[in-house]
């Protein structure tokens, strides 16, 4: 309604004697700002005076605040929005109705707020979820319809009078919608909390008790059980009787059914709190428990392990591992069902008792071929001795033994012969399936274990074979001792160490890498001419004419081998130099004359120098000296010098004659 002032605040506020009250409040006046505000206690409208009567707790006008008898009331609002109030302390006789008389320039309004002040602090209220189940987390809420900035309080949780360890979350609200203090506690109740008292205690800032609320926990849980057995150790012999009793120590709600389980499986027709087992057999050994159910679910007792004792049953042997590899370790395990466990064992190998072996396991750290055979055992406990079972077979596998390589040929073997070898062995488990040969070659294996080498090489020094099953055993290599003609024959210069210069002393060596047999002869030749029969060929003073292609031959009783042709190069300074002239030694002026420096040198001439008849050097570095155009003044004797890495050589003088042209003669 547009003719009303609009207020928002809690409808009723609660407090107790000596505490305080904080009244959150907002408003919107019809027009303009607030000019006057009076706070009445239990106001009544007087029709005669057209004013409100009642105790004035607080008053303010446009002239300013009128001093109040009581400083305990404070208007914390403003002239247009906020109308928040505080009363501190609050008294029992403040209960009733508070009237907020608001006046603006043209409008008036009375807003009423209820205040409920009790003589003592009122208790908080505990809120529980509708159902609590064991081990399921729940939130307990403690709510107090009070909060005031000037009067701090705290809420504490207790279980059976003892503060609870879990951390509570406290929140307060001081808004125009609600005023409260709330504590929330997250808690996972156990079945043992059923029936216990939970308290929410209101305390002042110093922890002094003010009030509380209590509730009794109703924790739904599955039945909690205890099992008792006679005899108490649950150890009996076959034929004895056993009684088990199931007791319910707690159940909420009441239990509905009872059953018994053995090794997790339900026993049929056993639905009472007592289980009687008469004349038990060994098959009845196992883990027993009782199960009682209610609406929450089934509860199980702890397990009782019933042991029915009996003498060992016929034994079996387990081998880790068969087949076993020679040199590996093997473990034999004697397996026999018995209760109590066997205390003594007797072991047999191929029917013969193994002395000193009385344990459940027999360990052989290094298996040998003779360990193969049948292993069996007998187990014994306090109730008797079992029977010997069928036993287990140990298969010991090993590489082929005593492998040898045998040459079938008559000796000696020559390069190019066909050689046959066989690979022999003594024993093997499993059987030999293949053979290997070293070194590898493109050789024939006409039958298993036989090798045929066609055209045997000079370098086939040794051959070894291996006989293989799962492993290969190698024989010692046998020497073929192949005889062959000398190999890798080559000419080697012994001296000089550097290049050969004309006049040097030169020695050539005929080298070869190997020969079998070792006794050899040498031959030297140059251009088909026999030079000597020693391993060395010597020149006291080499000349350029000794240069050429040299070969040496080495022979033994098998054959002879020649070296590659070796070129003997003799280095010498330029020699036999001469200057040739083109087109000739007589040239007409104005034409072109080319002088060429011809020489014999090794290495070839690298640098030419030209000289005139006065021995003056000309600026040319090439083999040819080109004069174009040639002049009469160029007539004269020329010579050249050739240089290589060995030295220099010079030519004799060659004369160039340049004659006048007909034109020049005509001019004269």
């Amino acid at each position: 309604d547009s003719s009303k002032w609009v207020f928002e605040h809690p409808e009723t506020l609660y407090a107790w004697e000596g505490a305080c009250v904080w009244i959150p409040c907002t408003y919107r006046a019809l027009d303009g700002d607030l000019e006057s505000f009076i706070l009445f206690h239990n106001p009544e409208y007087n029709k005669n005076t057209s004013k409100f009567d009642g105790t004035r707790l607080y008053e303010s006008t446009k002239d300013g605040k009128v001093p109040s008898e009581q400083k305990r009331v404070q208007f914390l609002g403003d002239k247009n929005k906020n109308c928040t109030l505080s009363i501190h302390p609050v008294h029992l006789n403040d209960s009733g109705q508070l009237g907020l008389r608001m006046e603006s320039k043209t409008e008036k309004w009375m807003e009423r707020i209820h205040l409920n002040v009790s003589e003592r602090p009122f208790p908080p209220h505990i809120q529980l979820p509708p159902e609590i189940q064991e081990s399921q987390e729940v939130t307990l809420t403690c709510l107090l319809n009070f909060s005031c900035y000037g009067y701090p309080i705290q809420l504490q949780w207790l279980l059976e009078g003892v503060p609870m360890r879990q951390a509570a979350v406290t929140s307060t609200s001081l808004t125009i919608k609600s005023v409260f203090t709330r504590s929330e506690l997250k808690f996972s109740p156990q079945w043992s909390h059923h029936g216990k008292i939970v308290t929410c205690q209101l305390q002042d800032a110093d922890g002094k008790f003010l009030s509380n609320d209590t509730v009794q926990l109703n924790v739904k849980h599955t039945p909690k059980l205890e099992i008792k057995v006679t005899p108490s150790d649950a150890i009996v012999r076959e034929g004895d009787s056993v009684t088990m009793t199931c007791e319910v120590s707690s159940s909420n709600p009441e239990y509905t059914t009872v059953s018994w389980l053995k090794d997790g499986t339900s026993l049929k027709k056993q639905n009472t709190f007592t289980l009687n087992l008469r004349e038990v057999t060994k098959d009845q050994s196992g883990k027993y428990c009782c199960q009682v159910s209610n609406d929450v679910g089934p509860g199980r007792s702890e397990e009782v392990f019933l042991q029915v004792q009996y003498a060992p049953e016929p034994s079996t042997v387990q081998i880790l591992h068969s087949p076993a590899v020679e040199g590996s370790q093997v473990e034999f395990l004697c397996m026999s069902l018995a209760n109590p466990l066997p205390t003594n064992y007797t072991w047999y190998h191929n029917g013969k008792e193994m002395q000193g072996r009385t344990e459940e396991k027999v360990h052989i750290p290094k298996i040998l071929p003779w360990h193969a055979g049948t292993y069996s055992c007998v187990a014994e406990n306090i109730l008797g001795t079992g029977q010997r079972g069928p036993g287990a077979e140990l298969d010991v596998q090993y590489p082929p033994k005593k492998v040898t390589t045998v040459i079938q040929n008559p000796m000696p073997i020559r390069e190019g012969d066909t050689v046959t070898l066989s690979c022999n062995y003594n024993s093997s488990n499993p059987s030999v399936t293949r053979y290997e040969w070293k070194p590898h070659g493109a050789w024939e294996e006409p039958s298993l274990g036989v090798l045929k080498i066609q055209n045997v090489g000079w370098d086939n020094t040794t051959i070894a074979c291996a006989a293989c099953n799962s492993w290969c055993s190698w024989a010692s290599p046998v020497a073929l001792n192949v005889q062959y003609a000398p190999r890798d024959v080559r000419v080697r210069k012994i001296k000089p160490l550097s290049e050969i210069h004309s006049g040097n002393s030169v020695s050539l060596q005929c080298d070869f890498s190997s020969s079998h047999p070792k006794e050899v002869q040498f031959f030297w030749e140059k251009n088909g001419r026999l030079l000597g029969k020693e391993s060395q060929l010597n020149f006291d003073s080499i000349s350029p004419e000794d240069a050429g292609s040299y070969s040496c031959w080495v022979n033994n009783s098998i054959g002879q081998t020649a070296s590659k042709a070796w070129t003997l190069e003799v280095l010498y300074a330029p020699r036999r130099l001469r200057v040739s002239m083109s087109p000739g030694d007589q040239v007409m002026e104005g034409k072109s004359a080319t002088l060429t420096c011809e020489s014999d040198a090794n290495p070839p001439v690298s640098h030419y120098t030209w000289f005139d008849w006065n021995n003056q050097s000309l600026p040319y570095h090439s083999q040819k000296l080109r004069l174009e155009p040639v002049k009469v003044q160029h007539s004269g004797a020329y010579w050249c010098q050739g240089t290589n890495s060995v030295g220099k050589g010079r030519s004799p003088l060659s004369t160039l004659t340049v004659y006048y042209s007909p034109e020049t003669i005509g001019r004269r």
Epitope: H607, W613, Q616, L618, H621, H634
Partner: antibody, heavy 127, light 111 residues
């Protein structure tokens, strides 16, 4: 200090003769360890050796095959200078022309490099 | 007679080293040890920097060095400086009737 000073016209008409002179100071044109060279430079042909003259017991000259037949190098011993004559020029002969010394003796051994250059003459062949 | 082949341009930062190659044939670079190198600044005459493959004329900085392998000669400038920015030409004596041949030239830029 050896210096080479060039002189001669910068503009020559096509088919005419180009004449340039190179005056030597600090050395002799008659030196028997030097040669006296002409080299030209143009954007299209780069650096190009044209020819040389030198004196040993008599005068010798050598020319590049690209200009042989229309080039001659002459010497004036009294003025210690040498000159280049290039006949029947064409616009292709436009470029900067340099005279240069080649000192052929480096101590006792042979050497070969253009160690002293003239300042250069820009020659344009155009009608 | 063909000109000797040089890279058109080479660049480097101050303090760096650069190398310029000069490739010819067995009739010129490969046949004689008469390779020389020239520096030319714009509008100036060439200046001799290296002669006879690896010799330095007096007055030329030892930052300039020359070498030859087979038919290829090289000029190396170490500790590059701003004043080294110029054109560089190689030259060789040749066995042809045109006695000397020059390289195509390399522009060196100092970054």
């Amino acid at each position: 200090e050896v210096q080479l000073q060039q002189s001669g016209p910068g503009l020559v008409k096509p088919s005419q003769t180009l004449s340039l002179t190179c005056a030597i100071s600090g050395d002799s044109v008659l030196s028997n360890s030097d040669t006296w060279n002409w080299i030209r430079q143009s954007p299209s042909r780069g650096l190009e050796w044209l020819g040389r003259t030198y004196h040993r017991s008599t005068w010798y000259d050598d020319y590049a095959s690209s200009v042989r037949g229309r080039v001659s190098i002459n010497v004036d011993t009294s003025k210690n200078q040498y000159s280049l004559q290039l006949n029947a020029v064409t616009p292709e002969d436009t470029g900067v022309y340099y005279c240069a010394r080649d000192r052929l003796q480096d101590g006792n051994s042979w050497s070969d490099a253009f160690d002293v250059w003239g300042q250069g003459t820009m020659v344009t062949v155009s009608s | 007679q063909s000109a000797l082949t040089q890279p058109a341009s080479v660049s480097g930062s101050p303090g760096q080293s650069i190398t310029i190659s000069c490739t010819g044939t067995s009739s010129d670079v490969g046949g004689y040890n008469y390779v020389s190198w020239y520096q030319q600044h714009p509008g100036k005459a060439p200046k001799l920097m290296i002669y006879d493959v690896s010799n330095r004329p007096s007055g030329v900085s030892n930052r300039f060095s020359g070498s030859k392998s087979g038919n290829t000669a090289s000029l190396t400038i170490s500790g590059l400086q701003a004043e080294d920015e110029a054109d560089y030409y190689c030259s060789s004596y040749t066995s042809s009737s045109t006695l000397y041949v020059f390289g195509t030239g390399t522009k060196v830029t100092v970054l």
